[in-house]
């Protein structure tokens, strides 16, 4: 049980936030799934792709991102150090130069093909929000997630303690 | 909040092993990685080897098939095996962690203050 203060705290500034350093401190591989175990599948139409939340068959293979992690500098009033250590913020890749993006005007979550340094809208701050389970806030727009509506992707205000944990901002990440 | 604290590291001859351990303590609500970076003198901290939560490594192309990185989730610690060490192993060898606390879920990285690794004949 975490008030929305404690998400606040580190988020109210990420309008100012910078990334350290243009390149990853860490990247690996996983697929990505809801908190009700249906997939995230990304497919290639009319020379777009599209993301889609859906039941996978029985031995049918998960698609996979690249998560690259990015210490971002904290503002001045927070220790970026040592023990406080730094905020992450993630990046995620199903496919080569492609990555998603937060329309926050749309509310959508998007697929755009786009060249580093990447916009802001392809940043998102990771959270553990319940065991085994993470959430993306978007960068460009504190106290939005990335969530599941409607059977895609979408992005989801989370305006009080309670909805925090709620299930459609919950995600879990595989290697396997 | 978050303390890592490595060890293991020291001087060997080329060819010869090491194992790094790095243990992580203080109010550590869920891990999502921890891993091993390095920094040779006059050059930029590179990523070695990461392990998830989920147990899914990455190693650097330079040390695949000669390190090997693991955890041990009830400690949480993370070890590095290095094998065939080479002289360009040479550096100082960074434990790093993505982490919660129970003050806050959002995920931070936390820094070892560096084991150094030196291999020379």
């Known amino acids: 049980a975490f008030g929305i203060s404690g998400v606040q705290k580190y988020t109210r500034a990420l309008h100012d936030s910078s990334i350290t350093g243009i390149s990853p401190i860490t990247e690996y591989l996983a697929s990505l799934s809801t908190y009700n175990d249906q997939s995230i599948t990304f497919a290639l139409e009319d020379e777009s792709y599209e993301i889609y939340v859906e039941d996978l068959k029985k031995d049918e293979k998960k698609d996979k991102v690249l998560l690259s992690y990015y210490e971002s500098q904290h503002p001045s009033n927070e220790s970026g150090d040592g023990v406080d250590g730094k905020m992450l913020m993630v990046t995620l890749s199903p496919t080569k130069d492609f990555w998603l993006h937060a329309n926050n005007k749309e509310h959508s979550v998007e697929l755009h093909k786009c060249e580093k340094p990447l916009p802001d809208q392809a940043f998102f701050v990771l959270h553990n929000m319940h065991s085994n389970c993470v959430s993306f806030e978007c960068k460009t727009d504190p106290g939005v997630f990335i969530g599941v509506k409607d059977n895609h992707l979408a992005l989801i205000k989370v305006d009080s303690s309670e909805n925090l944990c709620t299930e459609n901002i919950l995600f879990k990440l595989s290697e396997t | 909040q978050v303390q890592l604290v490595e060890s293991g590291g020291g001087l060997v001859q080329p060819g010869e092993s090491l194992r790094l351990s790095c243990a992580a303590s203080?109010?550590?609500?869920?891990?999502?990685?921890m891993g091993w970076h390095r920094q040779a003198p006059g050059k930029q901290r590179e990523l070695v080897a990461v392990?998830?939560?989920?147990?899914?490594?990455n190693y650097a192309d330079s040390v695949k098939g000669r390190f090997t990185i693991s955890r041990d989730d009830t400690k949480n610690t993370v070890y590095l095996a290095m094998n065939s060490l080479k002289p360009e192993d040479t550096a100082v060898y960074y434990c790093?962690?993505?982490?919660?606390?129970?003050?806050?879920?959002?995920?931070?990285?936390?820094w070892g203050q560096g084991t150094q690794v030196t291999v020379s004949s």
């Open positions: 392990v998830t939560s989920g147990g899914g490594t």
């Open positions: 790093n962690a993505a982490a919660s606390t129970y003050s806050s879920t959002v995920v931070r990285s936390f």
């Open positions: 203080g109010s550590i609500r869920t891990v999502n990685y």
